[in-house]
Amino acid sequence: CKAMHVAQPAVVLASSRGIASFVCEYASPGKATEVRVTVLRQADSQVTEVCAATYMMGNELTFLDDSICTGTSSGNQVNLTIQGLRAMDTGLYICKVELMYPPPYYLGIGNGTQIYVIDPEPCPDSDF
């Protein structure tokens, strides 16, 4: 019985449109059929939930309609995209994976991805 390891990139730079994507990969110790993926944000030792989705292995990852996250899954790899980010959202985003079913339950927490968000410069007024 080994712990579940979760890997994610150390740093990601959001696009000028405030979109950041990264891969969250987990080494599954068991044959899970139901997996929950949660993105957490850690700032000043406070942890908050950004989004979460539960999916059946082989099926697509579905976040709630009002979620700022989207994603796709392929085997033990989840491609996560967070949108609507602004400079103030710069921080550490942690990928948490839980193998929900069948038992036993396993918990895996990544080291976090530092997402840097730079607000675009406003376009200068142009005279024609």
């Epitope: 712990a3 110790p29 929950r36 957490l40 939930e49 918990l107 927490i109």
Partner: antibody, heavy 118, light 108 residues
Framework: QVQLVESGGGVVQPGRSLRLSCAAS????????IHWVRQAPGKGLEWVAV????????HYADSVEGRFTITRDNSNNTLYLQMNSLRAEDTAVYYC???????????WGQGILVTVSS | EIVLTQSPGTLSLSPGERATLSCRAS???????LAWYQQRPGQAPRLLIY???SRATGIPDRFSGSGSGTDFTLTISRLEPEDFAVYYC?????????FGQGTKVEIK
Amino acid sequence: QVQLVESGGGVVQPGRSLRLSCAASGFTFSNFGIHWVRQAPGKGLEWVAVIWYDGRNKHYADSVEGRFTITRDNSNNTLYLQMNSLRAEDTAVYYCARQGYMGSLDYWGQGILVTVSS
Amino acid sequence: EIVLTQSPGTLSLSPGERATLSCRASQSVSSSYLAWYQQRPGQAPRLLIYGASSRATGIPDRFSGSGSGTDFTLTISRLEPEDFAVYYCQQYGRSPWTFGQGTKVEIK
């Protein structure tokens, strides 16, 4: 602030049933797994059961499997533990506890005493 | 299941002294999934340390955790009167969730 308050304890005869409740407040209940942990008089902590998020997935300790049922009502922010076929060894203080985002049990209720005795 | 064994069973110390509590796992536990709790008489347990070394909100810095693999340690650098209590380690990386049997820190 986060609060968990247990109720429903008391004295019950062996073989009978009891239902414990845990009222939660101060956080988004459906975002968290909630556990029951018990402590027999003068003994250590023993994990009993957990229920996850939407209530579909549950896990139980071998000692209570088939006798205890954990449920939750997310609309009322309440957790339940239905205890059937109670035995003297089920006598304990029962705590509900929230599993925090990082996995540990970060908030606990004050506990409720269940005594199984004839 | 992962069995956690704590030692010593009882630690008799005076206020101001340093307390070192041990928790040994029957198999390797990732340090990300090891917690320590304090339980004072008549009270519910309180989370002190999670992830083997991260202090929970509001926990004073005299409490520190360390370790990896199968050996973990909780250290209280200078015992205050309110620190005399029972301490439990717990693993939460996989079910079933398990606790150590506890170490009682008592006044000498």
